[in-house]
Interface confidence: medium
């Protein structure tokens, strides 16, 4: 039975040219996190494997940095980075938990963070 919940940074906005941290946190479960996949729509951005470490897609290597923790830092943001991002937690024995973050990259300097929310 899957009892865990994923808390994410929710709907967030950031300024073009700036950087943003995508963060998810798995709670309410004792399951072991074996791997976290970060995906943008259907594209795999990065992997953090509990044993094998961080691996970043070549397409994003110049603009994506691992961490903090199991999170992901996006740098040199462009308007094209606007969209949905998913953190996929592979756990044992529970299975897979998925969190969703929507990022809006703004041209203006008025970029405010959205509220945190939970996905059961």
């Amino acid at each position: 039975m899957m009892t865990g919940t994923i808390e994410t940074t929710g709907n967030i906005s950031a300024e073009k040219g700036g950087s943003i941290i995508l963060q998810c946190h798995l709670s309410s479960t004792t399951a072991q996190v074996t791997q976290v996949n970060w995906e943008q729509q259907d594209q795999l951005l990065a992997i953090c494997n509990a044993d094998l470490g961080w691996h970043i897609s070549p397409s994003f290597k110049d603009r994506v940095a691992p961490g903090p923790g199991l999170g992901l830092t996006l740098q040199s943001l462009t308007v094209n980075d606007t969209g949905e991002y998913f953190c996929i937690y592979h756990t044992y024995p529970d299975g897979t938990y998925t969190g969703r973050i929507f990022l809006e990259v703004l041209e203006s300097s008025v970029a405010e963070h959205g509220a945190r929310f939970q996905i059961p």
């Epitope: 074996t34 992997i47 691996h55 996929i88 592979h90």
Partner: nanobody, 121 residues
Framework: EVQLVESGGGLVQPGGSLRLSCAAS????????MGWFRQAPGKEREFVAA?????????NYADSVKGRFTISADNSKNTAYLQMNSLKPEDTAVYYC?????????????WGQGTLVTVSS
């Protein structure tokens, strides 16, 4: 599921070198993160090194082998390698090759059967 077969183990003197190979079949290395683990007698299996062809050959190493071991992969031969230099008696262990599936929605390892490395004079 990918099948992995290790080779290259053996007896070597302290300070010597060995090169382990891990031949994969049933899948392409570029679809996996390849890792080497080892298990010494009476101890738990531990991470040694990893490489991902998918991420442009990103490599990670355990602190205990940094600067001595080098992991590499030849996608055309579907084989991963572990070059081990400056071997120490404490490197004695069974070395296992592992493939971690990382495509969206997948998880877990496929394991080889292991190859024994003994470092002794």
């Amino acid at each position: 599921e990918v099948q992995l077969v290790e080779s290259g183990g053996g007896l070597v003197q302290p300070g010597g070198s060995l090169r382990l190979s891990c031949a994969a079949s049933g899948g392409t290395l570029s679809s996996y993160i390849m890792g080497w683990f080892r298990q010494a007698p009476g101890k738990e299996r531990e991470f040694v090194a990893a490489i991902s062809g998918w991420s442009g050959g990103t490599t990670n190493y355990a602190d205990s082998v940094k600067g001595r071991f080098t992991i590499s992969a030849d996608n055309s031969k579907n084989t991963a390698y572990l070059q081990m230099n400056s071997l120490k008696p404490e490197d004695t262990a069974v070395y296992y090759c592992a493939a971690a599936r990382f495509a969206p929605g997948s998880r877990g390892y496929d394991w080889g059967q292991g190859t024994l490395v003994t470092v002794s004079s």
